[in-house]
């Protein structure tokens, strides 16, 4: 997360740390107990390590009585998703059992309404990616707030120039911004899941290139029919 | 299949203003800033000004401030053009086209005609 | 506003020949966010402009491979290797880095 702060410790229940061979890979977000939301490029980052969720942490390296690895049971990336693009960019991984629930880990709801927010719309967006252009992981959450940004002025040559389709919304860039390694974590409008972070090699904190979130409205009855 | 349907020949008498439209069919309009430029008779394309179709919110060559308002409609995904206090300098084809990816979408031009 | 000089102003071919198209910008013409708007419109007569190249050298979807763009900075070529029938008509480069944005003056591509 570019231009954020620490987060509250714990506030974001539903958030979690996608890991490969236990370094934190991607974000994620708990949208049942048993599973978890995230980016389909993250396994491909993933090589052949062993993937696994953390949740109910704060700091990735301390110790925390809510803080707990989890298995991965079975990765399912959406069926429409491909290396060289962004388009689908939805992955469920069911966590090896269902997830010990508690205020530190929570899962969140998410919008089944396939309606765009409003541009101007403030979210927040979370994650342990890198706080600086010289790549600074943090060791604890950090979260920013994001104004939406309008598809057309997202869609313009000198921004994604057509690249954004109604499955994907925008949010402003403008020195705050989610970055590498925040990929597949939430954004959260009044406290509902609308976007996941696009795990694209994009220029981060630059207000000409906005982040790409996947509308999870979109897909909704994909994440159903997974979920069943 | 994305289109830009732009309405027909107008010929107009000095003084005059027109208002020309361009209706876009085969993608969500309001997803996609529209631009217009206009092209003299055996010259090059000058760049208009452009409209985001969500807010109205609009850009303008300096050049062509006070001579073009660009409106739309996103009711009937249109949108419009109008020239003022025309004369024959603006007799010309007035193309719009959509941004995204550049401008890969044209309408077919409108040509404008001002004579007495 | 930014310049865009094209040369030559007409371009006679024999098809199957080999067409080189010059654009310079007055200023360059990076943006502030690094990239490149240079852009190659074809305009057949009585027809609207078509989008060839963008970003200096990407074709767009269903261009053929004959057409190449290169360039930086403020000196732009588009060539096409091995000129057809149908590639004949007005050439125009476009810069999209600066507002506003302009179109140079035009190549003819017409047959020798």
């Known amino acids: 997360i570019l231009g954020g702060r620490e987060a509250e410790a714990h506030a974001r229940p539903y958030m979690a740390s996608v890991q490969v061979n236990g370094e934190h890979l991607c974000g994620g977000v708990l949208v049942a107990e048993q599973w978890v939301l995230s980016a389909a490029h993250c396994l491909e980052d993933a090589a052949d390590g062993k993937v696994q969720v953390l949740l109910g942490a704060h700091s990735l390296s301390q110790p925390e009585p809510s803080k707990r690895l989890y298995d991965v049971l079975r990765a399912v990336p959406h069926p429409d998703s491909r290396p060289d693009t962004i388009d689908h960019d939805l992955l469920l991984l069911q966590l090896s059992e269902k997830a010990t629930l508690g205020p530190a880990v929570r899962p969140l709801p998410w919008q089944r309404v396939d309606r765009d927010v409003e541009p101007g719309t403030l979210c927040d967006v979370a994650g342990w990616g890198i706080v600086s252009h010289a790549g600074r992981r943090p060791d604890r959450l950090q979260h920013v707030l994001l104004p939406v940004l309008d598809r057309a002025t997202c869609n313009r040559r000198t921004h994604h120039d057509g690249a954004i389709t109604q499955r994907m919304m925008c949010a402003e860039s403008n020195r705050r911004d989610s970055c590498k390694g925040d990929s597949g974590g939430p954004l959260v409008c009044g406290g509902v899941l609308e976007g996941v972070v696009t795990s694209g090699s994009r220029v981060c904190g630059n207000r000409k290139k906005p982040g790409i979130y996947t509308r999870v409205a979109s897909y909704a009855a994909w994440i159903d029919s997974v979920l069943a | 299949e994305v289109h830009l349907q732009q309405s027909g020949p107008e010929l107009v008498k000095p003084g005059a203003s027109v208002k020309i439209s361009c209706k876009a069919s085969?993608?969500?309009?309001?997803?996609?800033?529209k631009n217009w430029m206009r092209q003299r008779h055996g010259e090059s394309l000058e760049w208009i000004g452009d409209?985001?179709?969500?807010?109205?919110?609009?850009n303008y060559n300096q050049k062509f401030k006070g001579k073009a308002t660009l409106t739309v409609d996103k009711s009937s995904s249109t949108a419009y053009m109008e020239l003022r206090s025309l004369t024959s300098e603006d007799s010309a084809v007035y193309y719009c086209?959509?941004?995204?990816?550049?401008?890969?979408?044209w309408g077919q031009g409108t040509l404008v005609t001002v004579s007495a | 506003d930014v310049l865009m000089t094209q040369t030559p102003l007409s371009l006679p071919v024999s098809l199957g020949d080999q067409a080189s198209i010059s654009c310079r910008s007055s200023q360059t013409i990076v943006h502030s966010n690094g990239d490149t708007y240079l852009e190659w419109y074809l305009q057949k007569p009585g027809q609207s402009p078509n989008l060839l190249i963008y970003?200096?050298?990407n074709r767009f979807s269903g261009v053929p491979d004959r057409f190449s763009g290169s360039g930086s900075g403020t000196d732009f070529t588009l060539k096409i290797s091995r000129v057809e029938a149908e590639d004949l008509g007005v050439y125009y480069c476009?810069?999209?880095?600066?507002?506003?944005?302009?179109f140079g003056g035009g190549t003819k591509l017409e047959i020798k």
């Open positions: 086209a959509r941004e995204g990816p550049s401008f890969a979408y």
């Open positions: 476009f810069q999209g880095s600066h507002v506003p944005p302009t």
């Open positions: 970003k200096v050298s």
């Open positions: 085969g993608y969500t309009f309001t997803d996609f800033y």
């Open positions: 409209i985001n179709p969500n807010n109205g919110g609009t």
